[in-house]
């Protein structure tokens, strides 16, 4: 008949497994339980995937790997503490008197339960990497952490190359023995030790469990170091940058850590495994039973087959590793799991022109001289779309793209953002809001929903803020309904008249030029350059100002740039910004200063796009280390990442306006990076590409 082959990872575990198998057999529990010996949890996962074993209990990190790499699924979960159920929480604790937040951890002193421990290392480090706060080059997480914190105690890090930094706060036992040991010899080991490291002032932050502070403060029976500690003197760091009381761990934590779970192959009946184990726990989980499922004392070890603290096993309803782990823990694991042996030696960058090839070649040499990993290789392509095709085909790895190209790269080629560009806060030409500006007019006020039949002013055909976003948004919202994909005609019929300057028109609807005025002599009407006085964002605003149009689609800065004395041309000299308003998507009107809340979309910064199987943290890690050396346009290190002037071009590899490369954080998809409004506008336009 049917049998379930449990995989044991050590001799003591094999011993306990044999006893469990015997106990189950004597109790008549079906199907029968057999034991297979593996060398490690990883090995057992491989055996299960190869159908040479069927089940094993794994911790969260191992469940992630088993699910992601081998398609295994969790079917039975452990429950420990009734209050939290099948999980506990990883938190970051600080002294109330300090000013540390999750955003200011760089340079602070840190206390960890132990190297590779879940809440003391895996979750915090993974979270910091995944959220973009900590950049890792070449999968060297230890180096990254040692550079990031201003000294740490990470018990067990003594054997690493970075022990000076990672063990700097550790103190060993009372006689100074066992410094940085991953054992109770190190006074700052484990949950209570990491908290002690914070409480005694050695560190500024401790990465522990949700219950650690409450178990070690307020006069509970404790060793002398904790006798006087008060829980109210400590706070938790929340992911949003705020802080909270230590009792608020449900709302304020780094991640919910899933309980250990039994995993099996996707084709194995999870219900069958639960029924087997449920019969077992019914008979063998209480004091005095002939076999103890949730105790390892008899074998001189801890946590064999199951965690000793398990109170019961429960069936898992949604049998996917993602659902069991939860998004917080899942994200942290993504940030942490980086295998240096599987890291490609090269990052192949897509280049589009001779000047770009030259700059990329110089970048590759400069990076190599500084031993930055992975090394850059330059591969040419004919167009951004060709780059996307080559990346999808695994012939190239990365390219920097603009908003519209990011949309295509994500939607059509499945690419994802790995890093983004960041521009100076005052630089409104590279990332900006698209707004609909109207005259402040109480008697004839209309809203965004009432634009039909109005007169419209646009910077030019195909301009992001003047055409693509507003027209796309109006199509997406159902106001403009193109017939036979003819957007131009549909727009011309929606507005009463418009000025949409254009270069080389063909079949262009005249009403889209009806409001245009040309140059001072009345020539060059509607041309797509400054000879048309209503061309560009300034021109579109002038079209509104001079009462040719009722609404102007412009950048959020356009009104400010041309009012209150900022533009001395006669048409603008006397204008006041308060005489204009914005039309909001919710049907309201707002002051022009409210552009961040009242806009049609934000034009996103450019981003580096890669295949979804590329480790984005290594890409950002490389760029982050590189920009420390080459990011400043005045650096003396022989290469300027964000300057193209030496190559007789502009915006080569990156936009010249870039101040820094930034992590994508939670914006891990093309939609996330572009933002919902911008995507909606592009979808409105792309729905018309027949």
């Amino acid at each position: 008949g049917m049998e379930v082959r449990w995989c044991a990872t050590s001799d003591p575990e094999q011993h306990k497994c044999g006893n469990m198998s015997e106990a189950f057999r004597e109790a008549g529990i079906q199907p029968s339980l057999l034991c297979v010996r593996g060398t490690s949890a990883d090995h057992c996962v491989q055996l299960i995937a190869a159908q040479e074993a069927d089940a094993i209990t794994l911790d969260g990190g191992a469940i992630y790997e088993a699910g992601k790499e081998h398609g295994l699924k969790p079917v039975v979960g452990e429950v420990y503490d009734q209050e939290v159920g099948t999980s506990y929480y990883a938190v970051a604790v600080v002294r109330r008197s300090s000013h540390v937040t999750i955003d200011t951890l760089k340079g602070v002193k840190s206390c960890h339960t132990g190297i590779n421990r879940t809440v003391g290392w895996n979750v915090p480090v993974g979270y910091l990497v995944e959220s973009g706060r900590l950049s890792v080059m070449g999968c060297d997480v230890l180096k990254a952490v040692s550079d990031y914190f201003g000294g740490s105690c990470v018990p067990g890090a003594g054997e690493t190359s970075y022990s000076e930094s990672l063990c700097r706060l550790c103190r060993g036992d009372s006689s100074g023995e066992g410094v940085c040991d991953k054992s109770p010899l190190e006074r700052y080991y484990d949950y209570s030790g990491a908290f002690r490291c914070l409480a005694e002032g050695a560190g500024d932050v401790a990465f522990v469990k949700h219950s650690t502070v409450l178990e070690n403060t307020d006069g509970k029976t404790l060793p002398s170091w904790g006798q006087a500690l008060l829980s109210q003197d400590f706070e938790l760091l929340c992911r949003d940058g705020s802080r909270a009381d230590v009792t608020e761990w449900r709302q304020c934590h780094l991640a919910r850590v899933p309980a250990h779970a039994v995993v099996v192959r996707a084709d194995t009946d999870g219900g069958l495994i639960f029924r087997l184990l449920n019969e077992g726990q019914r008979l063998f989980s209480h004091e005095g039973s002939s076999f103890q499922m949730f105790s390892s004392e008899a074998y001189g070890q801890k946590d064999l087959l199951f965690k000793d603290s398990t109170s019961e096993l429960v069936p898992i309803a949604t049998q996917t590793y993602e659902a069991w782990l939860g998004h917080e823990y899942l994200h942290a694991m993504k940030g942490l799991l980086c295998d240096p042996n599987r890291l490609p030696p090269y990052l192949r960058w897509c280049v589009l022109s001779t000047p770009e090839i030259q700059k990329c070649g110089d970048m590759a040499v400069a990076f190599r001289r500084q031993r930055l990993k992975p090394e850059i290789q330059c591969v040419s392509a004919k167009s951004p779309q060709h780059c996307m095709e080559r990346i999808q085909a695994e012939q190239v790895d990365a390219v920097t793209l603009s908003g519209e190209d990011i949309y295509t790269a994500g939607k059509t080629y499945g690419l994802v953002p790995a890093a983004g560009e960041h521009y100076a806060p005052e630089d409104s030409s590279n990332s900006y809001y698209v707004v609909a500006v109207v005259r402040r007019d109480s008697s004839h006020a209309f809203t965004l929903d009432e634009l039909r039949g109005k007169r419209s002013c646009h910077a030019g055909f195909g301009s992001p803020a003047g055409w693509d976003v507003p027209v796309g948004a109006l199509i997406q919202r159902g106001f403009i309904r193109p017939k036979d994909c003819d957007v131009l005609t549909a727009v011309s019929e929606f507005f009463n008249a418009s000025c949409v300057p254009v270069n080389n028109p063909k079949n262009y609807p005249s009403s889209l030029c009806a409001l245009c005025v040309g140059d001072e002599q009345g020539r060059n009407k509607c041309v797509g350059n400054s000879q048309e006085r209503y061309y560009g964002y300034r021109g579109a605003f002038r079209c509104l100002v001079e009462n040719a149009g009722d609404v102007a689609f412009v950048r959020h800065t356009t009104v400010f740039d041309n009012t209150n004395g900022h533009n001395s041309e006669p048409w603008a000299a006397e204008l006041r910004s308060e005489d204009y308003e914005l039309l909001c998507p919710n049907g309201a009107r707002a002051e022009v200063s409210q552009f961040a809340a009242c806009n049609l979309a934000q034009i996103p910064p450019h981003a580096v796009m890669v295949r979804p199987d590329t480790n984005i943290f290594t890409v950002y890690g490389l760029l982050d280390k590189a920009q420390d050396l080459f990011g400043d346009d005045h650096n003396k290190n022989g290469f300027k990442m964000f300057d193209s002037s030496n190559y007789h071009g502009q915006d080569l590899l990156f936009k010249d306006a870039t101040v820094r490369a930034v992590p994508v954080g939670e914006k891990t998809t093309y939609r996330g990076w572009l933002g919902l409004d911008y995507v909606a506008a592009l979808e409105g336009m792309s729905s018309q590409q027949c």
Epitope: D484, K506, N507, Y508, S510, L515
Partner: antibody, heavy 118, light 107 residues
Amino acid sequence: EVQLQQSGPELVKPGASVKISCKASGYSFTDYYLHWVKQSHVKSLEWIGRINPYNGATSYNQIFKDKASLTVDKSSSTAYMDLHSLTSEDSAVYYCARGGDYDFPWYWGQGTTLTVSP
Amino acid sequence: DIVMTQSHKFMSTSVGDRVSITCKASQDVYAAVAWYHQKPGQSPKLLIYWASTRHAGVPDRFTGSGSGTDYTLTISSVQAEDLALYYCQQHYRTPWTFGGGTKLEIK
């Protein structure tokens, strides 16, 4: 040089249908709309409608919606206009005309004379 | 539909004279007015669009002007070959509509 060569004169009976052709040359056929215009002594010039040769999309003057049907054959760079249920009022000269920078007739064919008579 | 009215069906002029042909729209057409001429036995030819922009190859004796609802085509010095029917057309809104035509006769 843009050329629009229309089919020859037609003499048809009331109630019949007719198909007038317009062969384009001297430019990329799918780049510009083709318009059709009726010229009669009674009503001077009347715009019938237009077709986008690229995708066959049409737009009609409402008064000709049930009278005319516009089609194209991209392979031969030819546009066609079918006129149905003909009456003496449909007797006229019919022009095809190519659009230009803007969406209205710029270059005209030589015209096709249609006579509807019993 | 927008109605285009050419009030003069005929205009008589002499070679070398200046002549103006007028056209009125039933509503503001934002200068989206074209002018054609049609010589006897020929098809119409585009002269002017956007009220004042001369089409390629059109002699500079032809000028257009106007705004709102009133438009004018002027021939500064009439030549014998200018004998033709002249039509205005609005290209602001479909359906495109034409004036009834003005026949220019040489005295």
